[in-house]
Structure formats: structure tokens, C-alpha cells
């Protein structure tokens, strides 16, 4: 059998605080424990959940936890169930509420000498004890003609008089704690001799030089006094007006009239009513001078047909707030339809081309009127005037591709070459009308071109193929001066291109035919063994049917290429001594010698006293210093070729002779001794 070791028991609990209903069972088999509340299973929540077999409450809730709890243990296998004793909470709580008028039914019915009952809507368990306050001061039973029962939630004032006027609040306490009224009640019972407001002045906004009227009336028994004051507490009467209120009139009924209002009249006006008894009643109203600022400019707008667009008109700052309306062609726009005004917005629903034009936003108040125009363009999809056409452009000349379109607004035209956007540079130029100019057409310009003409409404495009008409030209042009090495084989190439493959042939400039050892093989001039007589002027002629012929003149020089007779050697010199770097070259034409030392050419005219280049090409350096060390290059060149050779120069300190070294001892390295 299932036995309860611990059973839940009824207990006191505090609203919002923790609680625990204990339950522990002993059984032969596995049992499930669950809880019932008023016979219904309790579902676990974050607030209320099973903890082992017990039921834990993180925060007791007087509404959700009222009722009878029971712990049930069940053996699933047999189906046997055991139920604990019932347990419930005595939940202690207190909850704030307002002070309300119980009698009479409404505030309007409160009259002097009537009975007034207020009710304190603070509830709790156990039943709270109440305390009443007027203007924060506690009220006690039988005080100043009122009956108060601290056990009750009602406060009765009988009879109610002006002395009972004030702010009523209540507090209550019980075993849970204390709470005070969430909303208090202001009781106002008039004394006939107190000044009461009949008509209060309202803020006024007037235009400059217009008139302003403030109304003010009080009532009391006997009748009250009424006085007007301006900003600096200056009284305004018909007998004594301040200098800046010369045009002010106070009427018998209390109204104040200001005529021809100026900026200095703007400010706060006070109307003061004083009864025989009671405090003065002060009413304030402000006189504002109407004003209106300028309107911000509109940017021109471009819209597309069929779309819905809105243009917002920001009203200018002004007092009073300016009213705003839209006009088109001098007619005020309606508040509904296809083109209409909504608030400050101009709404164009399903825009048509005919909606284009100037729309005006107007703003107006007492101070005047302002207006601002907005130019609306209805964009159209471009149409063709002239499409780009497949074209043959001549190489080397300017070429044009047209893309002429029309639309509103003026379309923008961009060009693509092989799907790549053409950015304007020295070779490409797009004119305002959309025409593309290719300056100095090149062979590789022969491809597809596409132009796209666009407006916000859409775009059109067309493409054309460009074929480049190649000019007849040498590729590459032969060098006008060329050298051939004497007694060696030599070739002089000449090639050309054109619209048709050109024929190429060589001839001597004097018209004489080529010797038999010289052959012209498809444009390549071939010398089997160059002789002195082969030197001279030659002409390469390229020709085809449609383009005629072109000529390139070449002067061939026969030369003996440079060789070095003497080359500089690796040289080591003592500091302060003289270094000699020898160099001699031969060739035809006779070569010139130049020296380069430490990566700069040694200019014979700027060598200074220590260096000298001999006629035969040798370089001498006197009084060598360590900084003269480095690589020296001898460069030999003539009009046909150039050759160089180099050697290092080392500058070393002269060693101090040791005793063991005799006067005949050789130096440790090859030296030039001078």
C-alpha cells in the first residue's frame, strides 16, 4: 500500500512570497506524485512547480492559489492511488486603490451644507484598518463636524462646508502590511464670498496693427474686484495706462481690448479676481504676435508614369501654425482623386505624362502667406532618332557611332565595348547627343558596341559591329639605320599589313638590282656573307591592289664589330699610389672608349686632376684613396655596336715592413708600383 510520510497542511501565506506544501510517500513500487487544486491537476509553471513530491510556490498568488490542494500518489503498474489530506492557504494581502466619491453621485452635486461621503478603495485580507488624511494631515473621529470610523473605509462629512475643502487621501494596514490610496480626491466646496471664475481669458494670436480682446469674469457675494496686470505687474486701468499700452481699454464686464497691437504689446496678461474673503484668483493669458517664416526651396522632381509619388511640403515656422494647401495651374487640389492633397503632402497616384508641370505649395496664417513652386517632370522611356549601325571605320582616322534618342528628361547615354563600360579618355569621347567618337581608330577597335539610353522611366539599347579598315602599314616599320657585321651572314626583315595581304619586295635605292648573294625572301633581305659593297640605301616596298604601295628606306652600314685588344685586369694599389686600368678596342668604324666607375659614367671633361683617360683608352688614377675602390667598366662603342668589360680596383694600406722581411720580399698580392 502507498503510505504518506508527510502530508500537506493548511497554512498562512503572504501574497507574492514563497511557500511550500510538503508531501512525502512510501510505496512498494515506483509511484508518481502529482497535485490537484480543487480536483483539477496542477500544471508546473515558473511560479508554482513540483519539487520532488512537494509543491513549491515562488510567489503566492491570492487569485490562482485560492482553493484546496491535494497530493496524489499513483502506482502506474497497479493503478492504485492514495490521496493526502486537503490543504489550503490563508493568503494575507493588501492592494491599493483610489479614493472615490460615494455620495452624492457626482462632483457637480456637491453643495455647501450637504452630506459628502468618500470611500477608500484599499482592499486586503485580513480586513484592513483605515486612516483618513486631508491635505496630508490625519483626521480623527468627531473632528470638525465629520464622522470618521477608522474601522470603516468610508469618510462622512456632515454637513460639508468650505472648511472641508482639500485633498483627501487614505491609508490602510493589516497583517500583510500597509498601502495608501493610488489616486486621491480633491473636495472643493465654494464659499460664496470667495471669487469664482465665470469666464477665463484665452491665449490670443493677432496680426500686427490688429486688435486683441481678453474676456475675464468672476462671481462672488458680494461682487468681487477685478484687475488687469501686464508682464511687469503694471496695472491696466482706463485712468492709468502704462506708456506701451496707450490703446488698452478695460470694459465694465471685465474684458480687456487692445487696439493696433505692436510687438511690445506681446506678453502675459493677468486677470485678478478678489472676493470679500479668500485668496485672489489669478488667471493668465498670453498675447502672441502672428508671424510666418519663409519656406524652404523644392528640388525639381522627376517621376515615372504609372507610379505613385508624394511631395511633402514642410510648412514654414509660424504662429499660429500656418495652414498648408497645394495648387496646380492656379486651382487648389482636392483631398481625394488621382492627384490630391493629403495632409501636407501632394499625392500623385498613377502618374500620367499630363501631370507634369509646376505645383505650388501655399502656407498662410494671420501674419501673411508664403508659396513655393516645385517643378515636376514626368519621365518617359527614350525613343530612337538614330540607332547605332554596323560601320566600317578607317584605321588611324576618327570614327563615329550614333545613338540619338529623345525623352523627358534628356536621356543619359552610356556606351559599352565588348560588354565593358567605355570611360571617356583620350581615345573615346561621348558627345551630349549620345554620339561616340573614337579618335585614331585602331585595329582592335573592331568589335561590338552597345549604347544604352536611360531616363528614370526606363531605357532602350542597341548594338552595332565595327569593322576596322586596316591601313597599309609596315609592322613594324623597319629601322632607318641598320648595321651588318662584315664577313658574316645578315638578315633585314620587312613586314606589312593591310586590308589585303600586301606583296613585299626589296630594291636598292638607286634602282640597281640586288647582287646574287643577296636574296629577297618574302620581305626578308638575306646576305649570305656581307661585303663592303653591300653597304648603302635600300627600299622595302609593300603593295596591294586596293591600297597601292608604301615604301620604307633603310641605310645599311657594313661594320667590323668591336673586339677588345687589351682588357682591364683586377688591380690592387697601395693608398696614395697610381692605378692604371688599361683598355684598348678595335672595330670599324673605330670605336670610342668610355669608362664607368662605381655606377656612373666618368665624363672626360669633368674628371679633375687625379684621373685621366688616354687616347688609347686606358684610365689612370693618381693618389688613389680607399673610396676609389670598386668596379670599373670599359665601354667601347661605335655607330653599329657597343661592348663592355670590367675589372675591380682594390685600394689597400701599405704594410709596415717587419724585420724578418728583407728588402727583396715580394708584396702579398699583384701590385702596380709607381
Amino acid at each position: 500500500a502507498i503510505v504518506f510520510i508527510k502530508q500537506p497542511s493548511s497554512q498562512d501565506a503572504l501574497q507574492g512570497r514563497r511557500a511550500l506544501l510538503r508531501c512525502e510517500v512510501e510505496a512498494p513500487g515506483l509511484v508518481h506524485v502529482y497535485w490537484l487544486l480543487d480536483g483539477a491537476p496542477v500544471q508546473d509553471t515558473e511560479r508554482r512547480f513540483t519539487q520532488g513530491s512537494s509543491l513549491s510556490f515562488a510567489a503566492v498568488d491570492r487569485l490562482q492559489d485560492s482553493g484546496t490542494f491535494q497530493c496524489v500518489a499513483r502506482d502506474d503498474v497497479t493503478g492504485e492511488e492514495a490521496r493526502s489530506a486537503n490543504a489550503s492557504f490563508n493568503i494575507k494581502w493588501i492592494e491599493a486603490g483610489p479614493v472615490v466619491l460615494k455620495h452624492p453621485a457626482s462632483e457637480a452635486e456637491i453643495q455647501p451644507q450637504t452630506q459628502v461621503t468618500l470611500r477608500c478603495h484599499i482592499d486586503g485580507h485580513p480586513r484592513p484598518t483605515y486612516q483618513w488624511f486631508r491635505d496630508g494631515t490625519p483626521l480623527s473621529d468627531g473632528q470638525s463636524n465629520n464622522t470618521v470610523s477608522s474601522k470603516e473605509r468610508n469618510l462622512t462629512l456632515r454637513p460639508a462646508g468650505p472648511e472641508h475643502s482639500g485633498l483627501y487621501s487614505c491609508c490602510a494596514h493589516n497583517a500583510f502590511g500597509q498601502a495608501c490610496s493610488s489616486q486621491n480626491f480633491t473636495l472643493s466646496i465654494a464659499d460664496e464670498s470667495f471669487a469664482r471664475v465665470v469666464l477665463a481669458p484665452q491665449d490670443v494670436i493677432v496680426a500686427r496693427n490688429e486688435e486683441a480682446m481678453f474676456h475675464c469674469q468672476f462671481s462672488a457675494q458680494p461682487p468681487p474686484n477685478l484687475q488687469w496686470l501686464f508682464e511687469d505687474e503694471t496695472p491696466i486701468t482706463n485712468r492709468s495706462r502704462p506708456p506701451h499700452l496707450r490703446r488698452a481699454t478695460v470694459f465694465a464686464n471685465g474684458s480687456l481690448l487692445l487696439t493696433q497691437v505692436r510687438p511690445r504689446n506681446a506678453g502675459v496678461y493677468r486677470c485678478i479676481g478678489q472676493g470679500q474673503r479668500g485668496p485672489p484668483v489669478i488667471l493668465e493669458a498670453t498675447l502672441h504676435l502672428a508671424e510666418i517664416e519663409d519656406m524652404p526651396l523644392f528640388e525639381p522632381r522627376v517621376f515615372t508614369a504609372g507610379s505613385e509619388e508624394r511631395v511633402t511640403c514642410l510648412p514654414p515656422k509660424g504662429l499660429p501654425e500656418p495652414s498648408v494647401w497645394w495648387e496646380h495651374a492656379g486651382v487648389r487640389l482636392p483631398t481625394h482623386g488621382r492627384v490630391y492633397q493629403k495632409g501636407h503632402e501632394l499625392v500623385l497616384a498613377s502618374i500620367a505624362e499630363s501631370d507634369a508641370g509646376v505645383y505650388t505649395c501655399h502656407a498662410a496664417n494671420l501674419a501673411g502667406q508664403r508659396r513655393q513652386d516645385v517643378n515636376i517632370t514626368v519621365a518617359t522611356v527614350p525613343t530612337w532618332l538614330k540607332k547605332p549601325q554596323d560601320s566600317q571605320l578607317e584605321e588611324g582616322k576618327p570614327g563615329y557611332l550614333h545613338c540619338l534618342t529623345q525623352a523627358t528628361p534628356k536621356p543619359t547615354v552610356v556606351w559599352y565595348r565588348n560588354q565593358m563600360l567605355i570611360s571617356e579618355d583620350s581615345r573615346f569621347e561621348v558627345f551630349k547627343n549620345g554620339t561616340l567618337r573614337i579618335n585614331n581608330v585602331e585595329v582592335y577597335d573592331g568589335t561590338w558596341y552597345r549604347c544604352v539610353s536611360s531616363t528614370p522611366a526606363g531605357s532602350i539599347e542597341a548594338q552595332a559591329r565595327v569593322q576596322v579598315l586596316e591601313k597599309l602599314k609596315f609592322t613594324p616599320p623597319p629601322q632607318p639605320q641598320q648595321c651588318m657585321e662584315f664577313d658574316k651572314e645578315a638578315t633585314v626583315p620587312c613586314s606589312a599589313t593591310g586590308r589585303e595581304k600586301p606583296t613585299i619586295k626589296w630594291e636598292r635605292a638607286d634602282g640597281s638590282s640586288l647582287p646574287e648573294w643577296v636574296t629577297d625572301n618574302a620581305g626578308t633581305l638575306h646576305f649570305a656573307r656581307v661585303t663592303r659593297d653591300d653597304a648603302g640605301n635600300y627600299t622595302c616596298i609593300a603593295s596591294n591592289g586596293p591600297q597601292g604601295q608604301i615604301r620604307a628606306h633603310v641605310q645599311l652600314t657594313v661594320a667590323v664589330f668591336i673586339t677588345f685588344k687589351v682588357e682591364p685586369e683586377r688591380t690592387t694599389v697601395y693608398q696614395g699610389h697610381t692605378a692604371l686600368l688599361q683598355c684598348e678596342a678595335q672595330g670599324d668604324p673605330k670605336p670610342l672608349i668610355q669608362w664607368k666607375g662605381k655606377d656612373r659614367i666618368l665624363d672626360p671633361t669633368k674628371l679633375g686632376p687625379r684621373m685621366h683617360i688616354f687616347q688609347n683608352g686606358s684610365l689612370v688614377i693618381h693618389d688613389v684613396a680607399p673610396e676609389d675602390s670598386g668596379r670599373y667598366t670599359c665601354i667601347a662603342g661605335n655607330s653599329c655596336n657597343i661592348k663592355h668589360t670590367e675589372a675591380p680596383l682594390y685600394v689597400v694600406d701599405k704594410p709596415v715592413p717587419e724585420e724578418s722581411e728583407g728588402p727583396g720580399s715580394p708584396p702579398p698580392y699583384k701590385m702596380i708600383q709607381t
Epitope: L36, G39, R74, D76, V77, G79, E81
Partner: antibody
């Protein structure tokens, strides 16, 4: 322990039927009792349960249409079935715990 | 809601052979709360195993249960002719809203 069922039969869609299950050989009032059904050729489906204190539980498929009750004085369990549908047709078993089952009663729902 | 999936749907074996039936849960089941039933045509289900591995009263020791978490097994060590039937696994929990597997039919090969 014995569980004897009665009350099955043929009913039209939308009709009502009350099944009964009489228990003997155990203290009926201290046991959880429940109903399980088995449609032809299908698996077993739990339908409803009632605790010893009268707390009730229902499968979503029958909630609002079926009512489980018990009379501890008569050692009897009941299943009141209203608004019957074609998919309610099955053999209904009453059971106590896991090991004790009634012989089953067939409920046929057909127009 | 926990869903129980039994495999295989049908198992064909001969008397004397060993039978292994599987039951997989869609989420973890406390092993204390898994049962196995045997049902023969026209009869009410009969409890074989409860608590995943405990044999019910009068059940021969050739029937054994094992497993934990989401994978459970019913093993019949040596099939007898009377063992050929439909077998169901069942999950029972803190609420008496029990769920059953779709069943495994054990038939003679």
C-alpha cells in the same frame, strides 16, 4: 481482479453511446482507471483516464466530445461518447494500471 | 508528446530462434516508465514487461527487456509456438496520458 465491459454497438455519425466497465476483486475507489481503444488493424490509442478523486484526463482527439466518470459506490467506470465520428470506430478497452484490462467492446460508427 | 517507433514492422522467425524487437522514443524516456505488451487476435493486450526490464507476474523468463534513454529492446530467447503475436511498447509518465508504439508483428517463418 476482474473488469467486465458493456455498452458497445452500432451508432450513426453524430450519435452518442455510453460504455460501462464494472470492477471487482479490488477496492475500486482507490484506483486510477482509464480507457484505451484499438481501431481495426491499428495500434492501441489511449483515450481517457480518471483518478481516484475524480480528476479527469483526455486525448486531444476526443476532448470536448467524450466524458469519463466513475461511481465508486457501484465499482463502475463510464465513458459517455457524443458527436461520434467514423474515426472513433474501434474496440474500446477499460483498464486498471498496466496489467488489468477488460475484454473489450466494439463501437461501430456507420451511416 | 513522445512518439514511439517500433522496428521491424514484421519479424519472420522459426520456433526455437531468438527474437529481438526494438522500440525508439522521439525524446528520452525514464527507463522506469516503459512497458511491453503482447496481443493475440481478438484478445486484450497482456503486460509482459514494466519499468523497461521487470517481468510482470506469470511471464516466462524467456522474455526479457533492456534499454534506457531513447532505445529499448524486448528479447525472446527461444521462441515457442504460442509467442507468435503482435508486440507493443508503451510509455507511461507522470500524467496518465499513455502512448503506444505502432507494433511489431512476430510471425512464423
Amino acid at each position: 481482479v476482474q473488469l467486465v465491459q458493456s455498452g458497445g454497438g452500432l451508432v450513426h455519425p453524430g450519435g452518442s453511446l455510453r460504455l460501462s466497465c464494472a470492477g471487482s476483486g479490488f477496492t475500486f475507489s482507490t484506483y486510477l482507471m482509464y480507457w484505451v481503444r484499438q481501431a481495426p488493424g491499428k495500434t492501441l490509442e489511449w483515450v481517457s483516464a480518471i483518478g481516484s478523486g475524480g480528476d479527469t484526463y483526455y486525448a486531444d482527439s476526443v476532448k470536448g466530445r467524450f466524458t469519463i466518470s466513475r461511481d465508486n459506490a457501484k465499482n463502475s467506470l463510464y465513458l459517455q461518447m457524443n458527436s461520434l465520428r467514423a474515426e472513433d470506430m474501434a474496440v474500446y478497452y477499460c483498464a486498471r494500471g498496466l496489467g488489468y484490462w477488460g475484454q473489450g467492446t466494439l463501437v461501430t460508427v456507420s451511416s | 508528446e513522445i512518439v514511439l517507433t517500433q522496428s521491424p514492422g514484421t519479424l519472420s522467425l522459426s520456433p526455437g530462434e531468438r527474437a529481438t524487437l526494438s522500440c525508439r522514443a522521439s525524446q528520452s524516456v525514464s527507463s522506469s516508465y516503459l512497458a511491453w505488451y503482447q496481443q493475440k487476435p481478438g484478445q486484450a493486450p497482456r503486460l509482459l514487461i514494466y519499468g523497461a526490464s521487470s517481468r510482470a507476474t506469470g511471464i516466462p523468463d524467456r522474455f526479457s527487456g533492456s534499454g534506457s534513454g531513447t532505445d529499448f529492446t524486448l528479447t525472446i530467447s527461444r521462441l515457442e509456438p504460442e509467442d507468435f503475436a503482435v508486440y507493443y511498447c508503451q510509455q507511461y509518465g507522470s500524467s496518465p496520458m499513455y502512448t503506444f508504439g505502432q507494433g511489431t508483428k512476430l510471425e512464423i517463418k
